[in-house]
Structures are given as C-alpha cells and as structure tokens.
C-alpha cells in the first residue's frame, strides 16, 4: 500500500493523459484524484502505464468504491482488469452485455481466467439465465464454453438460447451433456418444419432417444454416418434393420465401413442375419 | 503451454484393477471439464467418464458404470481412473482429455491390457 504523502506543487494532475507515466508511485497516489480516474477511464488503456502504476490507480478505485466499482468504471477498466481478484469482481453489479464484451475482449485468445469465471459467473446470475444474448457473446470468445460446463449448469440453460448455439460449439460435448441439452434443443425447434429442423436439432442428436431417433427415420433426412456414430448406442441398439435404412437413406452403404465400430457394430450383433441381408451390404450379425 | 500426461497403464487380468492418473502442467486456469477417453486399434476414440468443472459431478458411459471411478484433485491439477472388475474388452489406450472454454488438451495416452 503506497504511503500518504502530499502533492508536489504544479503536479496536481488535472487529467487523465501521457504525463502520468512519469510520475512515480507515491506522485499518482497524492495527485491523481480518484474520481477524475472513474470519470475519465477510459483514457487509461491508452496510456502506457507500467504495471506498478496500474496497482495504484487500482488502489485509488478501490478506496473510491470500497462497495464495488460502479458499472460506468467496470466497463472501462480494460487491462486495469486484469489486476482484479475475484474478490474484487463478486462485489461488482454487471447488467450490460456491453460491459461483459468490453472485459472479455481484454483476456481474449487466452485461457478462461479466475477473474473472467468469476465475472460470467456474476453477469449470468444477475441476468437470472444464461440468455441467447449472453450465449452467443461467450461462445464467440471461448468456443468451448458450453462443452466445459457440468450438466448440472446446462441444465439452466433455458430452451430459447439454444438458437444461439452452433453445431461446433458442441464439438467436444460429452453423451452426458448432450443428454442434457438435446431435450432443450427438441423444445426450441419443435415448431420448425422436416428438413429445417433436422438441420438445426442434428448437432444435439448425441442426446436423442430411440423413440426420436425412429420418428426422424419416418422424415427421409438421409442423416450421414458421422452424425449416426455419435448417436448414443443404447438409443440406437432397438431401432429394426428398416427403420435405420430409413434414418440413413442413401448413407446406408457406409455402415459396411464402420461394421466394427461402435454403435453400429453392437446394433449388427442385435439383429437377425436374414434382415441385415436386406440391405445387401455383406454385414455379418 | 499446456501438457497433459497419462500414467499407470499396464497388463492386468479379467476381474482385476487398475488405477490410472493423469497429470496438466501449464496454466490451465478456471472451468475446466476433465474426460477419460479409450480407443482400441480401427476404432473410434469412445467416451469412458468425465468429472465436470463445477461440483466434480461425474459422467460415465454405460460399459464402465458401475465398474469405474473418476476423480480429481484440482489443487493438484491431477485426475484419476480407478478402474475395477476389468474386462478383455476395457482393453485399449485410455486417453486423458482436459477441456477448457477456450481449448481441447490431449494426453498421450497409456495403454491398458486386460489378459490372461
């Protein structure tokens, strides 16, 4: 903590701007005022401080707003966020998208920090869910967002931001998150017609049930055999010889390449050798 | 830079256990979901058990439930695969999976051969 000592005279500063990175620490800390600092943030990223003078600018915001920074400050803290603890953030009060942009754009390109979890964790519980809006911001800079989440956290999400989900963004999603969110992406896209919702719900698929997965076999949507891998096995295993050369279409003829592979080698050995015949692929059950 | 290392593979026989770790060095911070994965030779990589970011709730495939066990000590940066009542066909290279919001991190992987 920089020592109290009062301003040399002519030094006092009356704003924000370029002579303040000559001014050592204890010259901030008795010529800056603290409220010309929150007025006039924004001016702060533009200013080559070092990170020493950064700690004192923070310490004047902190003595200034011993409750938490007003979101006015927040929004222009820029690399001042950076030397923010989480303690620091959970007595913060952020409500605009703009404000959570503004501060995820200082960490991007790196991994999630403390502070960014702490703030995400703060904005999605202000805002009551994770909305579309919110959903779309975070998997635009952290692509991985929603597959790093436990089911328990996924399960909050509300139907209505799945619009915002892109099929990469699920990339990495595990059976048990899918499980959970391919029931939220059947509600959101329920009112959709045949070919337009297979297009949108085929990423979620990884979560369906036998009983979808034979109601899409009744829409011809020739699903293709990477989206069928995916599939979760039990849900794939009841489904007849007819219903997933239904499911496929012309696709078919790939399950003889991924014979040995999981779900489509245990679906063989299920059923009986004179359906699989059918198909004319040489599959052995 | 982010390394993920696996260990305690080896040969065991049917019925037996085994305990494998895995090990991430770097500055993996804030939210991440770990996974074990396993692939036998001309197969795809297949999903084993996942301990999430949050709570350490855990996830496991229907083949392993019951019989294995995921844990993390995050302090440590380090998860675990005890692994009981094995099977000739747990058999394959388990692969450690640590993902973060913004990456995917891989192992090595080790292997693991239930014989007798």
């Known amino acids: 903590e920089v020592e109290k000592t009062a301003c040399p005279s002519g030094k006092k500063a009356p704003e924000i701007d370029e002579s303040l990175i000559f001014y050592k620490k204890w010259e901030l800390e008795a010529c800056v005022d603290a409220a010309l600092l929150a007025t006039q943030m924004d001016r702060v990223n533009a200013i080559p401080f070092t990170y020493e003078q950064l700690d004192v600018l923070k310490h004047k915001l902190d003595e200034l707003y011993p409750q938490g920074y007003p979101e006015s400050v927040i929004q222009h803290l820029g690399y001042l966020f950076l030397k923010m603890s989480p303690e620091d953030i959970r007595k913060w009060n952020v409500t605009s998208l703009e404000t959570l942009k503004a501060l995820l754009e200082v960490n991007k390109g790196h991994e999630m920090s403390p502070q960014v979890a702490t703030l995400i964790d703060r904005f999605v519980k202000g805002r009551g869910q994770l909305d579309k809006d919110t959903l779309d911001t975070l998997t635009a800079f952290y692509p991985g967002y929603l597959c790093s989440l436990s089911p328990e956290e996924l399960s909050s999400v509300p139907p209505s931001s799945i619009w915002a989900v892109r099929p990469q963004d699920l990339d990495t999603c595990d059976p048990r998150q899918l499980d959970v969110l391919y029931p939220k992406a059947r509600l959101a896209f329920q009112n959709m017609n045949g070919s337009e919702y297979f297009v949108k719900i085929q990423s979620f698929l990884g979560g369906a049930p036998t009983e979808d997965l034979k109601a899409l076999s009744q829409q011809n949507v020739s699903m293709d055999l990477a989206t069928f891998m995916k599939l979760r096995t039990d849900a794939v295993l009841p489904l007849t010889v007819a219903e997933v050369q239904k499911l496929l279409g012309p696709h078919v003829e790939g399950l003889k390449a991924e014979e040995r592979h999981r779900p489509v080698r245990d679906w063989i050995l299920r059923q009986r050798q004179d359906d699989l015949d059918t198909l004319g692929l040489g599959l052995q059950g | 830079e982010v390394q993920v290392v696996e260990s305690g593979g080896g040969l065991v026989q049917p019925g037996g256990s085994l305990r494998l770790s895995c090990g991430v060095s770097g500055s993996i911070l804030a939210l991440n979901t770990m996974r074990w994965y396993r692939q036998t030779p001309g197969n795809q990589r297949e999903w084993v058990a996942s301990i999430y970011s949050s709570g350490g709730s855990t996830g496991y495939a229907d083949s392993v439930k019951g019989r294995f066990i995921i844990s993390r000590d995050s302090a440590k940066n380090m998860m675990s695969l005890q692994m009981n009542s094995l099977k000739s066909e747990d058999t394959a290279v388990y692969y450690c999976?640590?993902?973060?919001?913004?990456?995917?991190?891989w192992g090595q992987g080790t292997q693991v051969t239930v014989s007798s």
């Open positions: 999976n640590v993902q973060t919001p913004l990456n995917v991190y």
